[in-house]
């Protein structure tokens, strides 16, 4: 396993609809054709997998149908969007990139993006 640099923004604020987007960029050390991207969430020293996708260079990034993540890839950067977020989902979201094929296998883990989610205030009842 060889190490690889990964960069991502330090902080992102989710929209009022619970959507957060960020870029994950990696320093590809060679001609990888198969790449796996995983988003991990770290909160209270526990790490859980949020979503993952494997893609072939030049093809679209596809997550499972029930995934809360969507994304697009362009060269060695991936644009990730996480939806359905609520205040309790606030945490550090880490981008993990693996170059699966051809060998050698490379692994890169970003420093994480702190995503802040604020639940919208309920609309006050109106008399109209």
């Amino acid at each position: 396993c060889k190490a690889m640099h990964v960069a991502q923004p330090a902080v992102v604020l989710a929209s009022s609809r619970g959507i957060a987007s960020f870029v994950c960029e990696y320093a590809s050390p060679g001609k990888a054709t198969e790449v796996r991207v995983t988003v991990l969430r770290q909160a209270d020293s526990q790490v859980t997998e949020v979503c993952a996708a494997t893609y072939m260079m030049g093809n679209e990034l596809t997550f499972l149908d029930d995934s809360i993540c969507t994304g697009t890839s362009s060269g060695n950067q991936v644009n990730l969007t996480i939806q359905g977020l609520r205040a309790m989902d606030t945490g550090l979201y880490i981008c993990k990139v693996e170059l699966m094929y051809p060998p050698p296998y490379y692994l890169g883990i970003g420093n994480g993006t702190q995503i802040y989610v604020i639940d919208p205030e309920p609309c006050p009842d109106s008399d109209f």
Epitope: A7, E25, S28
Partner: nanobody
């Protein structure tokens, strides 16, 4: 859209040095990571060096590490490849390529670059 033009190639003796330039027009190069690649006759194109947008991140394959140095001057919209201790096996057409990125990294994979120059010939021979 950015356009790239390489220059500085030529004939040099083994052990000699050359400095290649990759000049950009049509856009500011500081928005782009830049890579140098080379292709010898009958061989696949191979990676030589890359540099991130700010210049703080560079990468090289083992075949040129310690001999080649990539730098950039964003004020001149130019990236340079300083090649020392040249060998016969360094003979090739050298291409620079650019990729618009958000952060400071760069890639040694030719698959990641979408804009390419026309190339400059480097011949190492006595």
């Amino acid at each position: 859209e950015v356009q790239l033009v390489e220059s500085g190639g030529g004939l040099v003796q083994p052990g000699g040095s050359l400095r290649l330039s990759c000049a950009a027009s049509g856009d500011t190069l500081e928005s782009f990571a830049v890579g140098w690649f080379r292709q010898a006759p009958g061989k696949e194109r191979e990676e030589v060096a890359c540099i991130g947008r700010t210049g703080e991140f560079t990468d090289y394959p083992g075949s040129v590490k310690g001999r080649f140095t990539i730098t950039r001057d964003n004020s001149k919209n130019t990236v340079y490849l300083q090649m020392n201790s040249l060998r016969a096996e360094d003979t090739a057409v050298y291409y620079c390529a650019a990729e618009r990125l958000v952060f400071h990294l760069c890639s040694l994979s030719e698959y990641d670059y979408d804009t390419w120059g026309q190339g400059t010939q480097v011949t190492v021979s006595s």
